[in-house]
């Protein structure tokens, strides 16, 4: 019963976690622009990993996608190659665990290859997880050092009289959706493991083994004393499945109409 | 068509308060921000606030915090802008102005103006 | 806040001449998230509201003629009236559109010489 509720837990938590890494790769809002002190702005940046929008005061929101491949920096790429990674992880594994649930029965499926694909899902699901962090991270240290930088010249041509002022960026939502999205694929993952553990059958085959005495034949069954003396066998059917086929998901986002005042 | 028609000419007396109204028709109120310009005569224009008609969400200049107030009735598509404590130099032409939507911040309708006259 | 400096104060120009006003801003004006420049020119007759021309530094505004135009990028920005018409006598002004508090020019007297 425990491992059932392990397992679905698991299963759901990994749901979640891995629509949030959809939502969190599809947002806009992976860095917003920064506001100082000022809580409103005429004009409002925001970028997501496919395109950049402006909100103006007015409401009105203009996106612009990425079109190109070789023009973005090599880290975005890196972000982008991470959250898809973990995406299409994230997508088998609950492929693989819908068929893995105890609650579910497809044919004659033993709990041996039920076991197994609960341990390969919890897998895929820890990766993905993983993946979804390294990804959100990456693209987190990317906004700090260049939050810095553009904060060290903040100001061009402090010498005359025109000043550029620098658009700085801090963290958007996105980042925040991943992190937790991430967080929650891993637990799932780690509970899906755990499930397995308790899905496994524990076989004990105790072989009898005769000794031959001079007089006499006696059978003895060796029991409480096999782990010490080397007799029976005490086996765990364990195999571990390295799933794998990757599919490309198409990432769309839609602009969102945001009056800021 | 659009037309912004705001209240009529106003004479108040120093350290009195204001309140010029602007009523919107031809377009869908809510969906277009508003805002109040005024111009002292033979000056330039001087951006005041802004309000949000949908949300009633008010955004004001520095210089006239405290002093100005933004409302909107939305059952009579009117907006109504106050100032209190005036002084003779906020003797001007006040101006309702809406934002085009997709203008990049410009304003594409103006109310014909109501002139406030501080005197003593 | 963003100062916005137009030049000349005001301009004599026979008609069908052209007419240029020039506006300098303190601050760019010019958004890198959409490569776009936030500022608006405005044509204001004695007793008259203001009336918009030009928004994104230049785009015409449905219904004005084409013989208004505007240039410009970042800080310096161009209104040109190509050929002067009698109606065009007026006072001209910019607009800063990219951060509160929005302001605007001095302003450009326009007459004919």
């Known amino acids: 019963m425990a491992v059932t509720a392990c397992q679905g837990l698991g299963f759901v938590v990994s749901l979640i976690g891995i629509a949030g890494i959809i939502a969190a790769t599809c947002m806009d809002q992976w860095s917003t622009q920064d506001l100082y002190n000022n809580p409103v702005t005429a004009v409002f940046n925001y970028q997501g990993l496919w395109r950049s929008c402006v909100r103006e005061s007015s409401g009105f929101t203009e996106c612009r996608g990425y079109f190109t491949l070789l023009g973005l920096p090599a880290m975005l790429q890196a972000v982008r190659a991470l959250m898809i990674v973990g995406i299409v992880l994230g997508a088998i594994g609950l492929l693989v665990s819908i068929f893995a649930l105890k609650c579910i029965r497809i044919g004659s499926m033993e709990d041996s290859a039920k076991a197994n694909m609960t341990l390969t899902s919890g897998i895929m699901f820890i990766v993905s997880g993983l993946c979804a962090i390294a990804g959100v991270s990456v693209f987190a240290n990317m906004l700090v050092t260049n939050f810095w930088m553009s904060t060290a010249n903040m100001y061009t041509g402090m010498g005359g009289m025109v000043q550029t002022v620098q658009t700085r960026y801090t963290f958007g939502a996105a980042l925040f959706v991943g992190w937790v999205a991430g967080g929650l694929t891993l637990i799932g993952g780690v509970m899906m493991c755990i499930a397995c553990r308790g899905l496994a059958p524990e076989e004990t085959n105790y072989k009898a083994v005769s000794y031959h005495a001079s007089g006499h034949s006696v059978a003895y069954k060796p029991g409480g004393f096999k782990a010490s003396t080397g007799f029976g066998s005490n086996t765990k059917n364990k195999k571990i499945y390295d799933g794998g086929a990757r599919t490309e998901d198409e990432v769309q986002s839609y602009p969102s109409k945001h009056d800021y005042v | 068509q659009v037309q912004l028609v705001q209240s009529g000419a106003e004479v108040k007396k120093p350290g009195a308060s204001v309140k010029v109204s602007c009523k919107a028709s031809g377009y869908t109120f809510t969906d277009y921000l508003m805002l109040w310009v005024r111009q002292a005569h033979g000056q330039s224009l001087e951006w005041m606030g802004n309000?949000?008609?949908?949300?009633?969400?008010?955004y004001y200049a520095l210089k006239f915090q405290g002093r100005v107030t933004m409302t909107v009735d939305r059952s009579t598509s009117t907006v109504y802008m106050e100032l209190s404590s005036l002084r003779s130099e906020d003797t001007a032409v006040y101006y309702c102005?809406?934002?085009?939507?997709?203008?990049?911040?410009?304003?594409?309708?103006w109310g014909q103006g109501t002139l406030v006259t501080v005197s003593s | 806040d963003i100062v916005m400096t137009q030049s000349p104060d005001s301009l004599a120009v026979s008609l069908g001449e052209r007419a240029t006003i020039n506006c300098k801003s303190s601050q760019s004006l010019f958004n890198s998230g959409n490569q776009k420049n936030y500022l608006a020119w405005y044509q204001q007759k004695p007793g008259q509201p203001p009336k918009l021309l030009i928004y994104?530094?230049?785009t015409r505004e449905s219904g004005v003629p084409d013989r208004f135009s505007g240039s410009g990028s970042g800080t310096d920005f161009t209104l040109t009236i190509s050929s002067l018409q009698a109606e065009d006598v007026a006072v001209y002004y910019c607009q800063n559109a990219h951060s509160y508090p929005y302001t605007f020019g001095q302003g450009t007297k326009v007459e004919i010489k």
């Open positions: 102005a809406r934002d085009g939507y997709s203008l990049r911040n410009a304003m594409d309708y």
């Open positions: 994104g530094a230049s």
């Open positions: 309000i949000n008609p949908y949300y009633g969400r008010t």
